[in-house]
Interface confidence: medium
């Protein structure tokens, strides 16, 4: 599949800069506004908190000989899970959660939540058309993933209002391609 455009649907996130002696004092403030994910905590440096990044993808479907007449629009779920303020009971990690530790056995991943099935027409080089039935992603969500699970099996635990893991490394999650089948 060819991605012609990808639009990020979340507001820009800037991480605080570690305080070093030579750094600029204004730029170097670790900001707490909007970091605590409470409904009234967005007073300073306000930004929208998102559960995970929903990237809007516009792409053409091709099976080798035939290509879709019009581009397909769908969401691609990507990035780290930053909790939504509206997640029930989520108020950040407590000391007792031990989620800070690198050795935490759980991670939160941004995965497909809602999908819909639609038919799409492909125009072939010989002038004929083919109809495919494809599944496109319409929403993303954070799911808790235990590390002993095989990543490829997508054996995720169900969503709960527990406290998310604090991530110590960037995780790249490859988005699933749209599933398609001949019909």
């Amino acid at each position: 599949f060819k991605n012609d455009a990808t639009e990020i649907l979340y507001s820009h996130v800037v991480k605080p800069v570690p305080a070093h002696p030579s750094s600029n004092s204004t730029l170097n403030q670790a900001r707490n506004g909007g970091r605590h994910f409470s409904n009234t905590g967005l007073d300073r440096n306000t930004r929208v908190q998102v559960g995970c990044r929903e990237l809007r993808s516009t792409k053409y479907i091709s099976d080798g000989q035939c290509t879709s007449i019009s581009p397909l629009k769908e969401l691609v779920c990507a990035g780290e899970c930053l909790p939504l303020p509206v997640l029930p009971n989520w108020i950040g990690g407590g000391y007792g959660t031990k989620y800070w530790s690198r050795r935490s056995s759980q991670e939160w991943r941004c995965v497909n939540d809602k999908t819909r099935t639609q038919r799409i027409q492909l125009q072939c080089q010989d002038g004929s058309t083919r109809t495919y039935k494809i599944t496109v992603v319409t929403a993303c969500k954070c799911k808790r993933y235990t590390r002993q699970h095989n990543e490829s099996s997508h054996n995720f635990e169900s969503m709960s209002p527990a406290k998310p893991v604090q991530h110590h490394r960037e995780r790249k999650r490859a988005s699933k391609s749209s599933k398609h089948s001949m019909s």
């Epitope: 670790a30 970091r35 994910f37 409470s38 009971n89 950040g92 407590g94 000391y95 031990k98 110590h168």
Partner: antibody, heavy 123, light 107 residues
């Protein structure tokens, strides 16, 4: 403005109990863990425990598990700590402190503290 | 429990001087360390968290560094109002623990 207003000083007899309050204002009370810290000249600062005001879930320092009980009243945005079977070793200043959780900076720390409640245990 | 050791109970300095306070953890705590300032008769105040992140509104003269077991809190140019006790605290494991404090005295 975020404020944590603690109850006044307490003078109690050995063996008695005391309940300290910490009224939060200026922020969403259920949006942050509340921690409790003991400060005494002998032991400096000691973490007693924390409570999730949304669920009432608590985590205690093992040392204080039999000594302290943490509760909250969401309707009044107030956190409480009850100390029981008091002895002279419990004489100290007790603080409530809101837990700062920075997801991007991967850090915890206590960003707002109450003014402290002095507890004196004496016969 | 992890023990946080601040080797100097007292440190004497002059206005304008650079001063560094050290803190040693009994085991690796990564960068899970915060620094607090407590002025006489006041509650502790958060200055640095995650070893090097300056908290909101904290002047740029206050910095933190270190990882693993050794941590340093530095005031690049001491002001008269910096007279206080400074505490380090680890939050790598429960219970979080504090150092014994270093009292900064101004000559």
């Amino acid at each position: 403005e975020v404020q944590l207003q603690q109850s006044g000083p307490e003078l109690v007899k050995p063996g008695a109990s005391v309940k300290i309050s910490c009224k939060a204002s200026g922020y969403s009370f259920t949006g942050y863990y509340m921690n409790w810290v003991k400060q005494s000249p002998e032991k400096s600062l000691e973490w007693i425990g924390e409570i999730n005001p949304t669920t009432g879930g608590t985590t205690y320092n093992q040392k204080f598990k039999a000594k302290a009980t943490l509760t909250v009243d969401k309707s009044s945005s107030t956190a409480y700590m009850q100390l029981k079977s008091l002895t002279s070793e419990d004489s100290a200043v007790y603080y409530c402190a809101r837990l700062h959780y920075d997801y991007d900076g991967v850090g915890y720390a206590m960003d707002y503290w109450g003014q402290g409640t002095s507890v004196t245990v004496s016969s | 429990d992890i023990v946080m050791t601040q080797s100097h109970k007292f440190m004497s300095t002059s206005v304008g001087d650079r001063v560094s306070i050290t803190c040693k953890a009994s085991q690796d705590v990564s960068t899970a360390v915060a620094w607090y300032q407590q002025k006489p008769g006041q509650s502790p105040k958060l200055l640095i968290y995650s070893a090097s992140y300056r908290y909101t509104g904290v002047p740029a003269r206050f910095t933190g560094s270190g990882s693993g077991t050794d941590f340093t809190f530095t005031i690049s140019s001491v002001q008269a109002e910096d007279l206080a006790v400074y505490y380090c605290q680890q939050h790598y494991s429960t219970p979080p623990t504090f150092g014994g404090g270093t009292k900064l005295e101004i000559k």
